[in-house]
Structures are given as C-alpha cells and as structure tokens.
C-alpha cells in the first residue's frame, strides 16, 4: 500500500474511561495534527478508519461495529462505546485516506474501574479554589455530547464517598457544584454522575476531580525575606566555611514563577571565579504559599571574600525585593602574653 | 485601631423584624470575611451567619437559616444582618466578628442586645 | 456539624496556680482552633489561633497545644484578670462551632 503519513503513537493524550460507561473520543488528527477539521476532509473525499490493537498484543484489527445494540459505533470522527468493556483496553488509530492521500495517528485507550467509592486509577483533573472566596464553582467535566439538549440527565455530586446533601457550604446545581466561603476542610475529590436515558438504556457518566484550596490573590503580597536580615551577622574567620540562608515567603498566586536567586558583588554566583555552591528546598503551606530556602556556601573563605557584597533576590507575579546578608571578618581574640601584655603597660 | 461597632438591637414582639448594623473603622472591611455570633442569656456562644469579604458568599446556622440575611456595604464600611420572623430563642447579645480562615474571629465589636418578647 | 466539648465546665484555682483547660472535636479539625477569653459583660478576645499560636498582644503565660481533635489551652501562672470564661472554637468546617465554655474561678 502506499505509503501514510504516520504520526505515531501520540501518549499525549491517554485516554481513560470508566469501565461500563458510555465513551466517545475524537479522532485527535482533526484536533492535533491537521489543519482542516473532518467535515472539510469528508466532502473533498477523504474517508475515516478506524482500528485498533488489543493489550498486549502487536496485531492491528479493524473494530467490529457490528456488536448487539451497536456498542462500538462511529459517527462523523467520534468513535462510541455503549458502553465499554474492560477488554476494550487497546491503541486505538484512526486514518484519513483516498487514494492520493493518507495520514494516521494512534492514541492508547485505558478502561478503568472503579469501586464504589469512586476510586481508581484515572488521573484526576484538579480545580483549585481560593479560600474565603465568595461563591465558586466546578463545573461536571466531558459531559457534552453524550445527550441532545433536549434530554434532561440528573445529576448527583458526591465528595469521597458521600453523597453531598446539605453541606453547610457545598450546594449542588445541576451540572455545576458550588462552594460558598471555600475553607481547606473542603479540599478533596468530588465526583458527578450524570444518569441519561437513550434508546430505552439507561447511561452513568461518572467525572472525578480533586478540588485544592489555595491562597487567595486577596491576601497574597510581594516576596517576604526573612534571612538574611538585620538581626544576623555571618562573622567568619578566613579559612571557616561561610553558610548563609536565603529564606524566602511567596504568597500563592496562579501561574506566578516565584524566583529566588543571589548575587555577589551584584553578579550572579556562575559569573565569578569564587568555589561557591547553592543548595535549594521548597517547601509548601496547606494553602500552596511556598518558602524557598537557598543556602549559599563558601567552603573556605577568604579574607576577600568577607569583603564582598551577597545579595538575597526574591521575585513574583506580585513584585520583586532584595537583601543583603551582613558578612565580616571576626576580630582575631587577642594573645594574652603579646597584646594585653603590652596593654597593661608591661615592656 | 480596629473597631466594630454594633447597633439595632432593641425589644421586639415574637413576628417581628429587626435589623442589626456593624460599623467598621481601622482596617479595610473590603478585605475581610465578616461573622455574625450571638450569646443568650447566661449560655455559650452561637455562630449565626458569615460573609465573604465580596458580599457574594453567605452562610447561615441552621437555626436561623430562612429568617436571617447577612449583607454588606463595603463603601459605607458596615455589616447589617436582617432578622425575620423572630422567636424567642433569638433573644440574645449580637456580636459582629472579623475573620480570616488563618486567625479565626480574631476582632468582635461589644454586642447589642436583641430581646424577643410579647 | 462538629461538636467540641470543653471539660472541665467550671475550674477553681488560686492565684499563682496552673489551670490546664480541655478542649475535644468530634471529628478532626487539623490545626484550626482557637482559644478565646470573656469576661462579664465584654465581648470574647481572640487568646490563641491556629491551636497554639498567640494573638496579637497575649501574655506568654498562655498557651495553647493539640491538633486533630484533642486540644489544651494553658495558663502558666493565673493572675487575677485571667478569671473569665474560656471557650474553644472550630474554623475548620462551616459551620464554625463553639464548646460550650470553661469558667475558670478563684479558689
């Protein structure tokens, strides 16, 4: 056959469904990989196959749209299961042929189950919530498209296990649930089931995703240093190994690039000749504000070195600040028998 | 210097409206999440309601869910809390806290007394 | 709705003395207690936050421990304006709740 644009084997995006629920994934040459969508390359001719490669197997096959009550279907660049089986597990690919033209990709499938708390390997989205915030939502994800909007599905939120009624302040709306005054108790996973009638079956779409309160862009300030500061002085003696911490508070703020970094002698610790190392940890609140610890380390020092300018540098979304460390050479203890002899008048 | 300042309170017949006023001066009441508590007679203290710093978010006891509203006039700096269909069990001291989810109610002003009564 | 209980309800000490308060969550409430004073005919002040922080302005004789459901607020030393009613309260779930209060009297 002639050859076929083959783009591989996209785990980008690794697709999982919930064992016994309906499906439908779009073949992701028209939403990755192309520049016209399927409606355009259907009336220029070009025709949609689908097939697939089981678990553990190496044998591509077509998949059998002829199953009772048409459980795998395709429909324009969607392919359906009504629902899936847990054996449905495989490389899907599509390809997009006539006979001048071809192009392909292939995406891995993963049907998985669930207890009856909702639990199991899916990969859960995560929706991140300000604390004290007024009113926020979630709203029930990769629902569209299973149902016209003529059918009206029911829908009911559960977080964990529990079925969410009369939460003091978690209110379900339909396809949306709401946190009032969102605190750090109402961190967690919340799943809707949307139950939908067709054909004379009856569907459950289950969707999981882990709710985390963060610190809310009302209290958050610009980076805070707390070392180095005015109360400590770095005395070091040539030759001791000089440590200096730089500690710093970010507030969280979505998409920030919290940046913490030092110079000396306002040059950056790569641009000079001196044996300097920079150890780094980051550490987290409950709310995701984020402190920054980097330690600078001299392992000899030198009487130079004690005369040098070392800046702490802390920037975010929210500003940028600076701090220098004091460092300075400690006075030698004076030797009894020369200086304090001589102090005391002694020849 | 922080202050809240309470007022509204007063007899009322069991039926009856009230509407009770919190004046905030010394910090911005934009920025923070206000409370309602109250204290009957002789007896502990009780959360009533809380708001959230932009007047959207508002959650109530249940004991007075329906019959009490919780607002805000962050231009004029005051808390109100509209009481409905007061009952006896309302009759208490209301208190208006400030609060952040980190300190608690961490500033009350000095409570006025509703008393419901015929 | 999380139930805290304060023992003991009433507490007798004598001035100079230690008072040891008690304070138990029905459920876990992480970190996020507080510790509050009230003296008759005065609005509550905020003594401890975050089960063992200290507010602004508070004496070091207070302190406060625990976490999860178990918590302890202690008063080092008892000086004579320290006779008050204590309670505890949660802000981990709404709706925020109160124990029902320890009045610490003179002996």
């Known amino acids: 056959s002639e050859r076929c644009d083959d783009w591989g084997l996209d785990t980008m995006r690794q697709i999982q469904v919930f064992e016994d629920e309906p499906a439908r994934i779009k073949c992701p040459l028209f939403e990755h990989f192309l520049k016209f969508n399927y409606s355009t390359a259907h009336s220029a001719g070009l025709t949609l196959i689908w097939y697939w490669t089981r678990q553990d197997r190496d044998l591509e096959e077509p998949i059998n749209f002829r199953l009772p009550e048409n459980r795998i279907s395709k429909e324009k660049d969607v392919l359906w299961f009504r629902p899936t089986l847990l054996n449905d597990t495989g490389n899907y690919t599509c390809m997009l042929r006539n006979t001048t033209y071809c192009s392909k990709v292939a995406f891995p499938l993963e049907v998985v189950q669930k207890d009856s708390c909702f639990n199991s390997p899916m990969k859960l989205p995560v929706h991140k919530l300000y604390i004290e915030y007024g009113i926020q939502r979630i709203t029930c994800p990769n629902v569209d498209g299973y149902f016209p909007s003529s059918v009206k599905p029911t829908i009911t939120w559960y977080m964990g296990c529990y079925k969410i009624q009369n939460f003091n302040n978690v209110i379900p709306e339909g396809m949306n649930l709401s946190f009032l005054i969102a605190l750090i108790s109402n961190n967690g996973n919340y799943t809707c089931v949307v139950t939908y009638p067709e054909n004379g079956r009856t569907f459950h779409l289950t969707r999981t995703l882990t709710v985390k309160v963060v610190g809310s862009p009302k209290n958050a300030v610009p980076p805070v240093i707390h070392s180095p500061n005015d109360h400590v002085v770095y005395e070091k003696e040539p030759g001791e190994e000089l440590l200096i911490p730089c500690t710093v508070y970010f507030s969280f703020l979505m998409d920030s690039r919290n940046e913490v970094w030092w110079t000396i002698d306002g040059k950056k610790p790569d641009d000079i000749t001196i044996d300097v190392t920079i150890n780094e940890s980051i550490s987290h609140s409950r709310t995701e504000d984020e402190t920054r610890t980097q330690i600078l380390s001299i392992k000899k020092v030198t009487s130079e070195d004690l005369k040098r300018s070392y800046v702490c540098h802390a920037r975010s979304a929210k500003g940028e600040v600076a701090k220098a460390a004091k460092v300075k050479q400690k006075v030698p203890a004076p030797r009894y028998t020369v200086e304090l002899a001589c102090g005391f008048g002694a020849t | 210097e922080v202050q809240l300042l309470e007022s509204g309170g007063g007899l009322v017949q069991p039926g009856g409206s009230l509407r009770l006023s919190c004046a905030a001066s010394?910090?911005?009441?934009?920025?923070?999440?206000m409370s309602w508590v109250r204290q009957a007679p002789g007896k502990g203290l009780e959360w009533v309601s809380a708001?959230?710093?932009?007047?959207?978010?508002?959650l109530y006891a249940d004991s007075v869910k329906g019959r009490f509203t919780i607002s805000r006039d962050n231009s004029k700096n005051t808390l109100y809390l509209q009481m409905n269909s007061l009952r006896a069990e309302d009759t208490a001291v209301y208190y208006c806290?400030?609060?952040?989810?980190?300190?608690?109610?961490?500033?009350w002003g000095q409570g006025t007394l509703v008393t419901v009564s015929s | 709705e999380i139930v805290m209980t304060q023992s003991p309800a009433t507490l007798s000490v004598s001035p100079g003395e230690r008072a040891t308060l008690s304070c138990r969550a029905s459920?876990?409430?992480?970190?996020?207690l507080a510790w509050y004073q009230q003296k008759p005919g005065q609005a509550p002040r905020l003594l401890i936050y975050?089960?063992?922080t200290r507010a602004t302005g508070i004496p070091a004789r207070f302190s406060g421990s625990g976490s999860g459901t178990e918590f302890t607020l202690t008063i080092s030393s008892l000086q004579s304006e320290d006779f008050a009613v204590y309670y505890c309260?949660?802000?981990?779930?709404?709706?925020?709740?109160f124990g029902q209060g320890t009045k610490v009297e003179i002996k």
């Open positions: 708001i959230s710093y932009d007047g959207e978010g508002t």
């Open positions: 806290a400030r609060f952040r989810y980190y300190t608690a109610f961490d500033y």
């Open positions: 975050g089960a063992s």
């Open positions: 010394g910090f911005p009441l934009s920025n923070y999440g």
């Open positions: 309260q949660q802000y981990n779930n709404w709706p925020w709740t």
């Open positions: 459920q876990s409430v992480s970190s996020n």
